[in-house]
Amino acid sequence: SGLNDIFEAQKIEWHELPRWRQQWSGSGTTSRFPETVLARCVKYTEVHPEMRHVDCQSVWDAFKGAFISKYPCNITEEDYQPLVKLGTQTVPCNKTLLWSRIKDLAHQFTQVQRDMFTLEDMLLGYLADDLTWCGEFNTFEINYQSCPDWRKDCSNNPVSVFWKTVSRRFAETACGVVHVMLNGSRSKIFDKNSTFGSVEVHNLQPEKVQALEAWVIHGGREDSRDLCQDPTIKELESIISKRNIRFFCKNIYRPDKFLQCVKNPEDSSCLSGI
């Protein structure tokens, strides 16, 4: 951004900039951010025995250290490495569920199918889900007024870099058959510019990942079209196949029914195929 250029070119200290310069286009840090992160960490480690060894104060210190006192348009993946190290967690093979533009359904699904995991079911994703945060250069303050917007201000902001970092790691550690939920109601069912399309797809490891199974989620109730034939799905298939990973696509024609049948497979409406 222009501000970034000024900062770099003139090498001026952040606190020397006039106050109006600190106004970003995005909403500010979520209120009670430190308390929320700490509380989520405690709750998560209580519910997940395999993460009971995690010291939540250390997690918060590492999280804070990634963005506090740093120019919020100059955050790097390196800044988050101490946090990533503390939050190291593995998903069993065949149990990774990625998603793109359909977060709510993906989360509803993993709440029912408890042995599958989205990034937000892991500690670091759980801590940050739906939160915004940023700091200010050379102060220990958290900026509750505004934070950089990915489009209008800069892409290397604390929130975007966090999700890029943990998404990359989540994809890198996936193994077996990896699943992804895609939104069949969007004009681009597969979007190369989404986190899935730009980060996760390219960080699946062919030596560990046997296949990517895409679930295209239909929006219309009576929509029986084969959305697996969509040009963007063919594009995804091409990208994945070139990476020596097998690709398979499934239509989820009625997501409500699918969820219901995963939850209650003995339900009479789930007992006969047509």
Epitope: V177, Y253, K257, F258, S272, I274
Partner: antibody, heavy 121, light 110 residues
Framework: QSVEESGGRLVTPGTPLTLTCTVS????????MGWVRQAPGKGLKYIGI?????NIYYANWAKGRFTISKTSTTVDLRITSPTTEDTATYFC??????????????????WGQGTLVTVSS | AYDMTQTPASVEAAVGGTVTIKCQAS??????LNWYQQKPGQPPKLLIY???TLAFGVPSRFKGSGSGTEYTLTISGVESADAATYYC????????????FGGGTEVVVK
């Protein structure tokens, strides 16, 4: 509607062999066709499948060893370089998609009688 | 993968008795489980699909049940004609074919 395999015979190791699955009353643009084999006294083993849209999926173990192709009424299975381990009865079967639980799956609902391939020197 | 494990490999049953065959998938196949019957010298014949739906013409003594990763084929009132080998197969993902059939269960009728 019927499915019939042909082309099975005695071949020497390394001699390519093509098996043909001929369908009658089945539109190959509407149905997928799978090849399954069964070694003497052993279980069923999926080799690969040709989808109605022309996609071909192979089992990992079968990649490079077999090639599937189709015409309007046949689906061929080429054994590129047979070994004695490829001695088996080869079945062709129609895969039928069906709906259930808000999504779909498949079943092999129509099978041929099979054709026997013996690989021996 | 979707690896199918079938047990037992062989089972004996008296005429009129009951046989139970189990099939376990390495991950959920959401009820898309098929059962086939194969008699010596014949191709497999579809018995049950979608875990519990009987294929056309299959007698009601054959019953399929289960969900998620665990499935069962039960033959009640076994007849001598039921002597055969039975296979389960996952029908959820036909793009991943390795081990998509179970190893088979031979049913011997005494």
């Amino acid at each position: 509607q019927s499915v019939e395999e042909s082309g099975g015979r005695l071949v020497t190791p390394g001699t390519p062999l093509t098996l043909t699955c001929t369908v009658s009353g089945i539109d190959l643009n509407s149905y997928a066709m799978g090849w399954v084999r069964q070694a003497p006294g052993k279980g069923l083993k999926y080799i690969g499948i040709m989808t109605s849209g022309g996609n071909i999926y192979y089992a990992n173990w079968a990649k490079g060893r077999f090639t599937i192709s189709k015409t309007s009424t046949t689906v061929d299975l080429r054994i590129t370089s047979p070994t004695t381990e490829d001695t088996a009865t080869y079945f062709c079967a129609r895969e039928r998609e069906f709906y259930g639980g808000g999504t779909s799956g498949s079943r092999l609902d129509l099978w041929g009688q099979g054709t026997l391939v013996t690989v021996s020197s | 993968a979707y690896d199918m494990t079938q047990t037992p490999a062989s089972v004996e049953a008296a005429v009129g008795g009951t046989v139970t065959i189990k099939c376990q998938a390495s991950q959920s196949i959401y009820n898309f489980l098929n059962w086939y019957q194969q008699k010596p010298g014949q191709p497999p014949k579809l018995l049950i699909y979608y875990a519990s739906t009987l294929a056309f013409g299959v007698p009601s003594r054959f019953k399929g049940s289960g969900s998620g990763t665990e499935y069962t084929l039960t033959i009640s009132g076994v007849e001598s004609a039921d002597a055969a080998t039975y296979y389960c197969q996952q029908g959820w993902n036909s793009g991943i074919l390795d081990n998509s059939f179970g190893g088979g269960t031979e049913v011997v009728v005494k």
